[in-house]
């Protein structure tokens, strides 16, 4: 059994997320998930679902009785998720930290937003798209 | 030419972004995506710039004056990002939405996380992963 | 201050097992990876394995994988690197490593800190 | 398989400036940190460069970390060259999940 499953359950009973009626009106993320198998759709995914765990968990970063709950399973989520590259964390922090709100960055985001834009395609920049994929524009 | 571009242009003389002086202090998201070469890893990124570009739009979807290239720059992230594939956009929506501090929220991210976790690595599902890759539990 | 203290090196014939520990102490032991690191006389820096912290996870060296294996007991603050069907060329000083913090974002460095190394002659 | 190539030896005169290389054989330098360490005889690795370009304390600034993603490598610059710097160098990153990886050592020889 992986370390994760006995800290998640400990978490539940903090959350007091074990009863059935937490699924009531449907699921978060599993639902989600279930419809997307290809790997890059599932990592688009799975991008926004991480963020949000982490969100989660700093809320209750100063909480004693939880703490080696949330510490392994983080850890659970960089060995998995990130492939315990911490330069891969490392970048998606800055990104999830980034305030909308700050005037500067609304600037810089906007200076680069056409080349940003440029790299969105899969394969923008190696010109492996398959034809099927193609933008056609007149 | 792609039909964001001048929009860009627009926004960038809206938000005062055309100036030499915006990338001062590195950019924002430029030199992380210039990090990541494979798609999945990109994704995992873009996933995170994508939904950040969302979030600032949204504060300025009653300026008019904006609105036209927002909506065009919008439309262009839907084809290119999304493959116009609404069914995507609108799962990526609904993640990026969820409240961190709203409780039920909350009970119901701890109560998936188990299975979450299950489905972080690559091929997780698939048993593709190579051997270099495997982590081994005593 | 952190310190690592690796132990049980020492002279070993071909095809013998033996097991060599390392003992932490001047941080959170269970929050840390642990690398183990090794070094033959007069030659480069070769990585063994690595355990990861909390969840210990064992990452090995393909060239390796299969005749060592990495354990620790986060209550004892130790690591065990235990070495088995040893051969002429594991003869190597043997450095246990603190690696990331991987439950924190702000982990110090990785490998900033080496113990001195414990010694592993395989000679007949 | 995953390689870091580093010259064999390297060597300047006093207060000049050497650099260091790192070839990354195959995969992205700039996906993996890249770590250098100093080795002096009879002592174990200390490092002087992490995460690519950061110094531990301790560390003095006339050593200098960089990576170029053009040419697939890091370097490690030492400026204002002195005696006590002559010692291996080593690069250090990564590869899949948490493999790590060294270069094969540099003799700084200081003249």
């Known amino acids: 059994q992986d370390p994760y499953v006995k800290e998640a359950e400990n978490l539940k009973k903090y959350f007091n997320a074990g009863h059935s009626d937490v699924a009531d009106n449907g699921t978060l993320f599993l639902g989600i998930l279930k419809n997307w198998k290809e790997e890059s759709d599932r990592k688009i995914m799975q991008s926004q679902i991480v963020s949000f765990y982490f969100k989660l968990f700093k809320n209750f970063k100063d909480d004693q009785s939880i703490q080696k709950s949330v510490e392994t399973i983080k850890e659970d989520m960089n060995v998995k998720f990130f492939n315990s590259n911490k330069k891969k964390r490392d970048d998606f922090e800055k990104l999830t930290n980034y305030s909308v709100t700050d005037l500067n960055v609304q600037r810089k985001a906007i200076h680069e937003l056409i080349q940003v834009m440029a790299e969105l395609s899969p394969a923008a920049k190696t010109g492996k798209r398959k034809r099927s994929q193609m933008l056609f524009r007149g | 030419q792609d039909p964001y571009v001048k929009e860009a242009e627009n926004l960038k003389k809206y938000f005062n972004a055309g100036h030499s002086d915006v990338a001062d202090n590195g950019t924002l998201f430029l030199g992380i995506l210039k990090n990541w070469k494979e798609e999945s890893d990109r994704k995992i990124m873009q996933s995170q710039i994508v939904s950040f570009y969302f979030k600032l739009f949204k504060n300025f979807k009653d300026d008019q004056s904006i609105q036209k290239s927002v909506e065009t720059i919008k439309e262009d992230m839907n084809v290119k990002f999304f493959n116009s594939n609404k069914k995507k956009r609108d799962d990526f929506e609904k993640l990026t939405n969820y409240s961190v501090t709203d409780l039920n929220v909350q009970r119901k991210a701890i109560h998936e996380l188990i299975q979450v976790m299950a489905e972080l690595s690559p091929a997780a599902k698939t048993g593709k992963r190579k051997r270099s890759q495997m982590l081994f539990r005593g | 201050e952190v310190q690592l203290v690796e132990s049980g090196g020492g002279l070993v014939k071909p095809g013998d097992s033996l097991t060599v520990s390392c003992v932490a102490s001047?941080?959170?032991?269970?929050?840390?990876?642990i690398h183990w690191v090794r070094q033959a006389p007069g030659k480069g820096l070769e990585w063994v394995a690595t355990?990861?912290?909390?969840?210990?996870?064992?990452f090995y060296s393909d060239s390796l994988r299969g005749r060592f294996t990495v354990s620790r007991d986060n209550a004892a603050n130790s690591v065990y690197l235990h070495m088995s069907s040893l051969r002429g060329e594991d003869t190597a000083l043997y450095y246990c490593?603190?690696?990331?913090?991987?439950?924190?974002?702000?982990?110090?460095?990785?490998?900033?800190?080496w113990g001195r190394g414990t010694l592993v002659t395989v000679s007949s | 398989n995953f390689m870091l190539t580093q010259p064999l030896s390297v060597s300047g005169y006093p207060g000049k400036t050497i650099v260091i290389s790192c070839v990354r054989s195959s995969g992205s330098v700039a996906s993996h940190y890249v770590q250098w360490f100093q080795q002096r005889p009879g002592s174990a690795p200390a490092m002087v460069i992490y995460e690519d370009s950061h110094r531990p304390s301790g560390i003095p600034d006339r050593f200098s970390g960089s990576v170029d993603a053009s040419s697939n490598s890091a370097s490690l610059t030492i400026s204002g060259l002195k005696t006590e710097d002559e010692a291996d160098y080593f690069c250090?990153?990564?590869?899949?999940?948490?493999?790590?990886?060294f270069g094969g050592g540099t003799k700084l020889t200081v003249l």
């Open positions: 001047g941080f959170t032991f269970s929050n840390y990876f």
């Open positions: 355990i990861s912290g909390r969840t210990k996870y064992m």
């Open positions: 250090q990153s990564y590869y899949g999940n948490n493999q790590v990886l």
């Open positions: 490593v603190r690696g990331y913090d991987h439950s924190d974002s702000n982990s110090a460095a990785d490998l900033l800190h």
